[in-house]
């Protein structure tokens, strides 16, 4: 069975969970006694179309309610577990009174007042964060939404909307609370070359192939112009004019320690003596800046078998 909750002395309106798009009449019963709930508005608890209204709700109204949708072919029964709570004495709103959490981004965001569409409400809706009324211009109440401009982590917390439901010339208060969290947005940072180390010397064998990988990390999320590339004697590999030395096409993307990284591999098909005198620069750059690690090659010492 589905659950609904409300606060004592506030209006609570619930819908039949089996309703779907049905236009057939709905009957409501107290599940434990099978007693039918009337449609007359003079009652504190009454049925209106597919809705069950508690105007206002009392703690003793808590219980399981059954709704039956009568259609020519079959009758569908739904059960709703309704709990009416006393108003929390402090500002700490317990989890059982919270509607689903809303996750925001780093730009603008909106929070919808939960269940408001069930009520006959009129603007404005009042909004509170951790029980304090929101008055900063960054917070804008519009229809059933609260818009927050330039969201930061400081905006996380419990947001309560309060509005008035009008019925038969009487106004009833309704409050609903939900948590708001800010999604951890990506961050960009000055590039860090994780490999090879600064001023590294690599051992190679003359005539044999060699490959040097350069990896750098740039933060997390979207990275504009982040790149890892090789230069030989301060010249881009493609313009160096040595067909034996090639930079691998495409950048290998990876994630390391929750960071976005790129790797570029420099391949030498057959190392020559001349290659030992060249300077190989691994460059990592983005809009923050550029870092250069210079690598040199040296001939591998033969193993002494004496």
């Amino acid at each position: 069975s589905k659950s609904s909750w409300g606060l004592e002395n506030e209006a609570l309106i619930v819908r039949c969970p089996q309703r779907g798009r049905s236009t057939y009449p709905v009957e409501w019963y107290y599940s434990d006694t099978n007693e039918s709930i009337p449609t007359q508005k003079r009652n504190r608890i009454f049925v209106s179309r597919d809705r069950l209204k508690f105007l206002p709700a009392r703690v003793e109204d808590s219980g399981i309610y059954a709704c039956v949708i009568r259609s020519p072919n079959l009758n569908k029964t739904g059960y709703l577990n309704v709990t009416i709570h006393k108003k929390p004495p402090s500002c700490n709103i317990p989890d059982y009174l919270m509607y689903s959490t809303v996750r925001g981004s780093d730009k603008n965001f909106k929070i919808t007042c939960p269940t408001i569409d069930l009520y006959n409400w009129t603007a404005p809706v009042q909004w509170f964060k951790n029980c304090k009324a929101l008055q900063e211009p960054r917070f804008r109440a519009h229809r059933s939404y609260l818009f927050i401009d330039n969201v930061t982590h400081d905006d996380e917390g419990d947001y309560t909307c309060q509005f008035t439901h009008a019925e038969n010339g009487t106004n009833y208060i309704v409050t609903a609370t939900r948590s708001f969290t800010v999604e951890e947005k990506g961050f960009s940072m000055f590039p860090v070359i994780t490999n090879p180390p600064y001023n590294h010397t690599m051992e190679v064998e003359i005539g044999k192939p060699a490959s040097i990988a350069c990896s750098a990390c740039f933060g997390k999320g979207s990275h504009f112009l982040a790149d890892v590339l090789w230069q030989i004697n301060k010249t881009v590999v493609g313009n160096f004019g040595e067909a034996r030395i090639q930079e691998e096409e495409g950048r290998n993307e990876s994630s390391s320690n929750d960071m976005d990284c790129l790797t570029s591999v420099l391949r030498i098909t057959g190392v020559t003596e001349k290659d030992l005198s060249l300077e190989y620069d691994c460059l990592a750059l983005n809009l923050h800046g550029m870092i250069r690690h210079t690598i040199r090659l040296r001939r591998k010492q033969p193993i002494d078998h004496r």
Partner: antibody, heavy 126, light 113 residues
Amino acid sequence: QVQLVQSGAEVKKPGSSVKVSCKASGYRFTDYYIHWVRQAPGQGLEWMGIIQPTGGGTTYAQKFQGRVTITADESTSTAYMELSSLRSEDTAVYYCARVGATVTKNYYYYYGMDVWGQGTTVTVSS
Amino acid sequence: DIVMTQSPDSLAVSLGERATINCKSSQSVLYSSNNRNYLAWYQQKPGQPPKLLIYWASTRESGVPDRFSGSGSGTDFTLTISSLQAEDVAVYYCQQYYSVPLTFGQGTKVEIK
């Protein structure tokens, strides 16, 4: 000294394209990004896009996406900005500018735009 | 996009007096990873390209007179000309380089009273 020299003024018909060049000298061209910024008559500065000359990576302002192409030729230390489908509101002075950098040992910390070209006036008129 | 808003739009100051220009960004341009504000100030005289005055919100570009200073952090920044000279008559722009697209303020025209 470090300088950026741009190509001369252009008069173009609506619907056509213009290609403005920006020749860099006095520094290692591949180590610094080049920005393109425009300024309509009597108006403020508007950033168009950026190129990283070594790898040729570019990023453009959404407004110009699909109409602007920024390229760089490392051999001549020249950056180019081509704007297509010109309309009268593209009449402006177009500037190239080098990203500023604090250079320490093997680090370049980029900031703002420290060297600007003299500007190229592009007039779009039928 | 980060919106940069300058105030005032124009400013008339007597020679030798202090001129103050404000710049507000629609979101913070302070990078927590390096504690730097990604904000620059430029001066543009008629018929000339802009000239960089200040970067990292408060670092003076080499060759810029020390009467120019920048301050502020996060979203609120100020360019101050401590003692206005005749050659300071120009339009001044703030610009964020925190994120793409880079954006400029609308400019503040400084004149002599």
